[in-house]
């Protein structure tokens, strides 16, 4: 089964779910899933949709920041110089770290060694000023294309 029209889907940014039909096993799904001992088809589906959403959110954040910077560069610098863009970069970095951490939670670090290492390295480099460019490159070239596609394809094929 192919990806859900990923490019077209990226126009939107999603959210919605419902109540289990009084299934006692379902009640413990989240707990077991977070412990890494149980993953339902539905959980895999949620993972793949959140991955798409996360990339879209990051792209939108980057796009919005770049547009603002182009139009209002002098206002964006703030009194401290690069305050706004630094905060945006920091927030993107935090989001990326949290999301990757969430993805690997319950699966083990060895399942995503490259991605975890990259995110940790980005965190270490934030202070030296090279973080933003690297983050954008990683997101555009690795997360959005290779990692997320691999993640979604894997989950969809696993589901069968």
């Amino acid at each position: 089964r192919s990806l859900q029209d990923t490019e077209e889907k990226s126009r939107s940014f999603s959210a919605s779910q419902a109540d289990p039909l009084s299934d006692p096993d379902q009640m413990n799904e989240d707990k077991r899933h977070s412990q890494g001992t149980f993953t339902s088809d539905y959980s895999k589906y949620l993972d793949s949709r959140r991955a798409q959403d996360f990339v879209q959110w990051l792209m939108n954040t980057k796009r919005n920041r770049n547009n603002i910077a182009k139009r209002h560069d002098e206002f964006e610098r703030h009194a401290e110089g690069t305050f706004t863009s630094d905060v945006s970069s920091y927030l993107e970095g935090q989001a990326a770290k949290e999301f990757i951490a969430w993805l690997v939670k319950g699966r083990g670090r060895r399942d995503f060694p490259e991605e975890v290492a990259i995110v940790e390295e980005l965190g270490r480099r934030h202070a030296d000023g090279s973080f933003s460019d690297e983050m954008n490159t990683i997101l555009d070239n690795l997360a959005a294309r290779d990692f997320i596609n691999w993640l979604i394809q894997t989950k969809i094929t696993d589901r069968k």
């Epitope: 889907k9 999603s14 919605s16 959110w57």
Partner: antibody
Framework: QVQLLQPGAELVKPGASVKLSCKAS????????LNWVKQRPGQGLEWIGN????????NYNEKFKSKVTLTVDTSSSTVYMQLSSLTSDDSAVYYC????????WGQGTTVTVSS | NIVMTQSPKSMSMSVGERVTLTCKAS??????VAWYQQKPEQSPKLLIY???HRYDGVPDRFTGSGSATDFTLTISSVQAEDLADYYC?????????FGGGTKLEMK
């Protein structure tokens, strides 16, 4: 066990505001979308908006943008929805529901706008 | 906005009959369509997600199919407890939208 707790009912006067709550438990609050859905008596479902606590994102249905304000309190794992300038059209059951396909629903809060 | 149109608005069935409910999207909704069951005075319950995937604990007499603009919920052998309203909903693009519902009644 996943639970979305909502107060049962609110009686409010026309023109007033009301703040509805949806307290989540039994899962990691930051990791899931929470949606708000309106259902008028004998009518269908309408999506109002949603929030993703972990990313600090809030989305609104344009139809409800001037009526509704969503806020999130991560410390209490609660999402709030404030309805303003209430009229009889706002009398409805308001549900909160979790994530893309609303796999978990609260019991709903019945809002009655009456003088 | 994607408009979801359900048909029929209501239908009367006998126990054991096969029921087919349809939902038509005004534009492409991919497979991001779900089906819900709502009984009187209860919250809705998820039956089908991602177009055709039965949610955990849902009896296998419920089957979803379709993609893009045409979606179907089939109940292979309707039971008395299936008396309810049924809604489709899309989460492909904002704002998410629901169909107007189909009321399933028993003869």
């Amino acid at each position: 066990q996943v639970q979305l707790l909502q107060p049962g009912a609110e009686l409010v006067k026309p023109g007033a505001s009301v703040k509805l709550s949806c307290k989540a438990s039994g899962y990691n609050f930051n990791d899931y979308w929470l949606n708000w859905v309106k259902q008028r008596p004998g009518q269908g479902l309408e999506w109002i908006g949603n929030a993703y606590p972990g990313w600090g994102i809030i989305n609104y249905n344009e139809k409800f943008k001037s009526k509704v304000t969503l806020t999130v309190d991560t410390s209490s794992s609660t999402v709030y929805m404030q309805l303003s300038s209430l009229t009889s059209d706002d009398s409805a059951v308001y549900y909160c529901a979790r994530d893309y396909d609303n796999a978990y629903w609260g019991q709903g809060t019945t809002v009655t706008v009456s003088s | 906005n994607i408009v979801m149109t359900q048909s029929p608005k209501s239908m009367s069935m006998s126990v054991g009959e096969r029921v087919t409910l349809t939902c038509k999207a005004s534009e492409n909704a991919g497979t991001y369509v779900a089906w819900y069951q709502q009984k009187p005075e209860q919250s809705p319950k998820l039956l089908i997600y991602n177009g055709s995937h039965r949610y955990d604990g849902v009896p296998d007499r419920f089957t979803g199919s379709g993609s893009a603009t045409d979606f179907t919920l089939t109940i292979s052998s309707v039971q008395a407890e299936d008396l309810a309203d049924y809604y489709c909903g899309q989460s492909y693009s904002y704002p998410w939208t629901f169909g107007g519902g189909t009321k399933l009644e028993m003869k």
